[in-house]
Interface confidence: low
């Protein structure tokens, strides 16, 4: 049986083709606004939109096993469509501007097409052919055309106006569109060429399907959805009346679904993603910033990326040749981003979220979620309030600072407590930073009157103040170990500056047009920073060869940046307190001569064996 | 120790807009950490939250309602207000100011105003 | 948003005996992040549990909390007379936050 679907923001209808009546609503919960829709006709599911929610969701056809299977990183996401042959869904965001692709779950996403693209909307796909044809509405409207894994891209009808509903009759190769500000409905072959106009006396043209001899439309000012014959326009007939913003409709048929491509085999024996491509060929395509394997089947994720917070979100971005767009990593429940740190041993993300005041870990693609350090009393007195991170990947440490108890706290990454390691009456230490390659800490000390820079062993002893002078409000620290430098910025101050690791040679690396640095990270031969006020994630080359560059604008609520660097697993092994903390039962430091000793916090003392720590 | 106290009229007539301040002492909105919240309670039914206002003046509405609240503070004075557009009978109710804590629950609340709205 | 269905709506119960009051999540909303009032007739609600098992301040421990996921569970050991009283559970693991329509635990 066939029959129409259609959204209307906070319903999805459904009316047999047969009888032409029977509207029925497909029972879903939850839905805000609806907007673009597609359906598998194998699984027996639809898939939708909702431009409130910025999600996409599926459903089995009665409206149970209800799924959002994209909810990160979507703006205005106007046009989808599902990759029945791939079983791949791929949508168009107008906000993003991008053109994205996924599984039919939701898993191994992938940005398409995000250069030069400007508010994408309607989106059609020949699976069978490879290609995928899409609407743009900025700028200079017009109808492109490209494979489907982004490539061999073209536009095919240059003047039109905003185009919207685009179909595919399958069966005799012809595109068909509603032009919103012509309100007309056109077609032409699948060149773009040998263009029709279908039907010229309507009032508002808006969603568009076709289904054997048939268009079918939705018109917003008649407030109804019609039909006609799709080669003359005429044999008009009204299906359904008095419905209002019917944002799209679609023909549910096996029909509209038939054809083969080797994706449709085994999913072309590719591990993450099956992608068409003309004529007849398929290429296996990886997840975002992942990198497909000299096997070209199989893929491997990145292990040199920049990670980037803002207020409610964490963003992974990778330095290629393909200038590849940064990505949303999918964790759920973030509400204030503090700070950030990674661990290249489990690949595992941590951070400070200040709403909630603690520290979270998981694994990049969200699962995992744990909580690492959390307050047990919700009084007006926080007992903590976790500030900044920093982890000692050798011991496996977290040492974070507190802007309740204004100390350096020390917990293991399962979540354990080590104990405090600094503390003082007048600390109040911020932004940490360690360095386990030679055993110590930097922190800034914003006292009163008196801000500092500070270092200290890893457990807590050895302190010496670096900078005392020069200094208003030393918010960030970043260390490259291979280059002995210690990096800072100062918001009031407005510069960021650096030194040799003892807090020799100092220099102002930039003082110019910066106005809210809040993060600072090295990467390669570059320092990143974040500008919070400009929103903005600049860098500057510190061999003075290239300068300062801008790296990425308008991002909204910035709140700090890390590099990760490929994790050497022999260099790694060959630290001493790598081996099980070095047979320490709390910290293990490295000392002059790459020996280790073992420490204890401050509430302990080291026991008599010299590796545990008991009370005094 | 922490008191909250709500103020505001008895009766609003339909259309009117409703203004509640909510009036506390023993905390401030100045600290990291804390905030303000409304909750309200029609006559023998559920809570229902309506929005919230914390120390950096984050602001969060109820989904159904936000194109009808607005919530602000005057940290000075230790005030929260509230301000309801378009009241109708169904909005009649005993309306609740709480203190929220991290992670977001209320820790202490005023008695409560109830507010007739009826021509 | 998130729906959050109390059962039963009524609990008939004698002092001494053990109650025990559901809340189920129409989605996930984790292990840390539901709270149970409780409010007697003509008072405001009172914090009984925070992140779904830890007691307020000043609650005795015969009450107690359990669950996560979607289905979570108040447990009050053995009914006091002042125990009796309308409890609603509320989710605050995604905006905007939500409560339960509420379990009323009357006196047999």
């Known amino acids: 049986e066939a029959f129409l679907l259609f959204s209307r923001r906070a319903d999805i209808r459904r009316i047999s083709l047969e009888t032409n009546n029977n509207n029925v609503a497909i029972p879903l919960t939850g839905v805000k606004e609806a907007s673009a829709l597609d359906f598998d006709v194998t699984d027996n599911r639809i898939y939708w939109t909702d431009i409130s929610l910025k999600t996409i969701s599926r459903a089995f056809m009665n409206g149970s096993a209800l799924e959002h299977v994209v909810e990160f990183g979507l703006d205005a996401p106007a046009g989808m469509a599902v990759d029945w042959l791939g079983k791949n869904l791929y949508w168009a965001d107008t906000g993003t501007n991008r053109i994205e692709v996924s599984k039919l779950d939701g898993q191994h996403r992938q940005v398409l097409v995000w250069k030069d693209l400007d508010s994408p909307r309607a989106l059609a796909l020949d699976p069978a052919e490879g290609f995928m044809y899409w609407t743009e509405w900025g700028g200079k409207p017009k109808i492109d055309r490209a494979a489907m894994d982004g490539s061999e891209r073209t536009t095919l009808v240059p003047n039109v106006g905003r185009a919207n509903g685009l179909t595919i009759d399958y069966a005799k190769r012809r595109l068909y569109w509603t032009d919103l500000d012509t309100n007309l409905i056109e077609s032409s072959n699948m060149l773009g060429l040998n263009r029709e106009v279908i039907a010229d006396d309507l009032p508002h043209p808006f969603g568009l399907t076709q289904y054997q001899d048939y268009i079918y439309w939705t018109d917003w000012s008649r407030r109804s959805i019609e039909r006609a014959n799709k080669t003359s326009g005429q044999n008009r007939t009204i299906i359904q009346g008095h419905l209002d913003y019917v944002m799209d409709i679609l023909v549910f048929h096996s029909s509209r679904q038939s054809g083969w491509n080797e994706c449709a085999s085994s999913n072309g024996h590719c591990s993450h993603l099956c992608l068409a491509v003309p004529v007849g060929g398929f290429v296996c395509g990886c997840p975002a910033h992942y990198s497909l394997n000299a096997d070209n089947r199989t893929c491997s994720a990145p292990t040199t990326f920049l990670l980037f917070s803002q207020k409610s979100a964490i963003n992974r971005m990778v330095i290629d040749e393909q200038q590849s767009p940064d990505i949303i990593l999918p964790i759920h429940s973030l509400r204030n981003v503090r700070a950030i740190d990674y661990d290249p041993l489990d690949k595992q993300l941590y951070w400070i979220d200040s709403r909630q005041n603690m520290i979270r870990k998981a694994q990049e693609d969200g699962s995992q979620g744990f909580t690492v350090v959390v307050s047990s009393v919700p009084s007006q007195n926080l007992e903590i309030q976790p500030y900044d991170l920093s982890i000692d990947i050798y011991s496996r440490y977290i040492y974070w600072t507190c802007e309740a108890t204004n100390v350096i706290n020390v917990t293991r990454l399962d979540g354990r407590s080590v104990g405090v390691v600094l503390k003082g009456e007048q600390d109040r230490p911020r932004a940490v930073v360690v360095n386990p390659e030679k055993g110590y800490m930097y922190f800034t000390n914003l006292q009163e009157r008196s801000p500092k820079i500070e270092r200290a062993a890893l457990d807590g002893t050895e302190r010496e103040v670096l900078f005392f002078s020069g200094l208003s409000k030393p918010i960030a620290l970043a260390l490259d170990s291979r280059l002995g430098k210690l990096f800072w910025a100062d918001s009031d101050l407005r510069r960021i500056e650096s030194s040799d690791l003892s807090g020799a040679n100092r220099i102002v690396l930039e003082d110019s047009n910066i106005l809210q640095p809040v993060g600072l990270t090295v990467f390669e031969n570059w320092l990143y920073w974040i500008d919070k006020q400009q929103q903005m994630i600049e860098k500057i080359d510190m061999t003075g060869r290239e300068g300062r560059t801008k790296v990425q604008a308008r991002i909204a609520q910035l709140s700090d940046i890390h590099a990760v660097k490929e994790l050497n697993l022999q260099e790694y092994r060959q630290h001493p307190c790598a081996q099980d903390n070095g047979g320490c039962s709390h910290i293990c430091l490295v000392k002059g001569d790459g020996t280790t000793r073992c420490s204890c916090p401050m509430h302990l003392v080291l026991l008599q064996d010299e590796l545990s720590c008991g009370e005094p | 120790q922490v008191q909250l106290k709500e103020s505001g009229p008895a009766l609003v007539k339909p259309t009117q807009t409703l203004t509640l301040t909510c009036t506390f002492s023993g905390f401030s909105l100045s600290n990291r950490g804390g905030g303000v919240g409304w909750i309200r309670q029609p006559p023998g039914k559920a809570l229902e939250w309506l929005a919230w206002i914390d120390w950096d003046d984050d602001k969060s509405y109820s989904t159904s309602l936000k194109t009808r609240l607005t919530i602000s503070k005057d940290t000075s004075k230790n005030q929260v207000v509230l301000t309801m557009t378009n009241m109708d009978p169904v909005d009649t109710a005993t309306y609740y100011c709480?203190?929220?804590?991290?992670?977001?629950?209320?820790?202490?609340w005023g008695q409560g105003t109830l507010v007739t709205v009826s021509s | 948003d998130i729906v959050l269905t109390q059962s039963p709506a009524t609990l008939s119960l004698s002092p001494g005996e053990r109650a025990t009051l559901s809340c189920r999540a129409s989605q996930f909303i984790g292990s840390r992040y539901l709270a149970w009032y409780q409010q007697k007739p003509g008072q405001a609600p009172r914090l009984l549990i925070y992140?779904?098992?830890n007691r307020a301040t000043g609650v005795p421990a015969r009450f107690s909390g359990s669950g996560s996921g979607t289905d979570f569970t108040l447990t009050i050991s053995s009914l006091e007379p002042e125990d009796f009283a309308t409890y609603y559970c509320?989710?605050?693991?995604?905006?905007?936050?939500?409560f339960g329509q509420g379990t009323k635990v009357e006196i047999k």
């Open positions: 709480a203190r929220m804590h991290l992670p977001l629950v209320f820790d202490s």
């Open positions: 992140g779904a098992s």
């Open positions: 509320q989710q605050y693991y995604d905006y905007p936050q939500t």
